[in-house]
């Protein structure tokens, strides 16, 4: 049975040209995290695997940095980076947990951080 919950940074906004940290945290489960995949819509951004370390997908290498922790740092943001991001936790024995983050990249300096929220 899947008992865990994923807490994410929720709905966030950032300035064009700036950087942002995408964070997810899996709690309330003793399941072993095998791998965390970060995806934007259907595109793979990065992988963090317990045995093999970090991998940043080639098309994002210049603007994505691993960490902190299992999180992901997006740099040199553009308006095109606006959209949904998913952290997909592959765990044993529970299975797959998915967290969603919505990022809005703003032209002006009015970027504010949204509230944190949980996805069961």
């Amino acid at each position: 049975m899947m008992t865990g919950t994923i807490e994410t940074t929720g709905n966030i906004s950032a300035e064009k040209g700036g950087s942002i940290i995408l964070q997810c945290h899996l709690s309330s489960t003793t399941a072993q995290v095998t791998q965390v995949n970060w995806e934007q819509q259907d595109q793979l951004l990065a992988i963090c695997n317990a045995d093999l370390g970090w991998h940043i997908s080639p098309s994002f290498k210049d603007r994505v940095a691993p960490g902190p922790g299992l999180g992901l740092t997006l740099q040199s943001l553009t308006v095109n980076d606006t959209g949904e991001y998913f952290c997909i936790y592959h765990t044993y024995p529970d299975g797959t947990y998915t967290g969603r983050i919505f990022l809005e990249v703003l032209e002006s300096s009015v970027a504010e951080h949204g509230a944190r929220f949980q996805i069961p």
Partner: antibody, heavy 120, light 110 residues
Framework: EVQLLESGGGLVQPGGSLRLSCAAS????????MSWVRQAPGKGLEWVSL????????YYADSVKGRFTISRDNSKNTLYLQMNSLRAEDTAVYYC?????????????WGQGTTVTVSS | QSVLTQPLSASGTPGQRVTISCSGV????????VSWYQQLPGTAPKLLIY???QRPSGVPDRFSGSKSGTSASLAISGLQSEDEADYYC???????????FGGGTKLTVL
């Protein structure tokens, strides 16, 4: 179409060397962990070696450790296996295989194999 | 000697259900995922089951995988003559840090 094509097999004397290549096509090679698996005549499958996305993490079966080296060139979409100090027991069909995006899940794409014969 | 243990052979008649077992230890099957492969004579292996119980697209639902403790099994229902092949289980071993295979099971359709 997702494809793996091995080459470089042949007849070699004991103590000799051989370099196998595996050309990948139809997928983003950089995003996948790769392995070499071999099969001696009339025998079962034996895993040989594994390499992560950018080649900074490699693993080997005890039977080939110190003699074989796995590597990859992502710019050429090619996987390699450098085999040194070859022995008669290395005679086998060598397959390159792609791991599932979560590498521990399984090997989802296999090449057709290349035959290595070690004999005097 | 393979790290994972499979029966050397199995057999069944067309339409029957056949199960092939795969036995491991606490550092592989018990805490990791199992995958199963079918190898027809003279061909490369083909993935049948990944993540212990999931089927890749194109694999008939006659094939199913399950796992309990340090053992896993592959079940083939509605056996067909074209299922005659060698079947292999495999898992990542956390202690050895290696990909381990079973010795293979030769399935004969009588």
């Amino acid at each position: 179409e997702v494809q793996l094509l091995e080459s470089g097999g042949g007849l070699v004397q004991p103590g000799g060397s051989l370099r196998l290549s595996c050309a990948a096509s139809g997928f983003t090679f950089d995003d996948y962990v790769m392995s070499w698996v071999r099969q001696a005549p009339g025998k079962g499958l034996e895993w040989v070696s594994l390499i992560n996305w950018n080649g900074d993490k490699t693993y080997y079966a005890d039977s080939v450790k110190g003699r074989f080296t796995i590597s990859r060139d992502n710019s050429k979409n090619t996987l390699y296996l450098q085999m040194n100090s070859l022995r008669a027991e290395d005679t086998a069909v060598y397959y390159c295989a792609r791991h599932w995006i979560v590498f521990q899940y399984g090997l989802d794409v296999w090449g057709q194999g290349t035959t290595v014969t070690v004999s005097s | 000697q393979s790290v994972l243990t499979q029966p050397l052979s199995a057999s069944g008649t067309p339409g029957q259900r056949v199960t092939i077992s795969c036995s491991g230890v606490s550092s592989n099957i018990e805490i990791k995922y199992v995958s199963w492969y079918q190898q027809l004579p003279g061909t490369a292996p083909k993935l049948l089951i990944y993540n212990s119980h999931q089927r890749p697209s194109g694999v008939p639902d006659r094939f199913s995988g399950s796992k309990s403790g340090t053992s896993a099994s592959l079940a083939i229902s509605g056996l067909q003559s074209e299922d005659e092949a060698d079947y292999y289980c495999t898992s990542w071993d956390d202690r050895l840090k290696s990909w381990v295979f079973g010795g293979g099971t030769k399935l004969t359709v009588l």
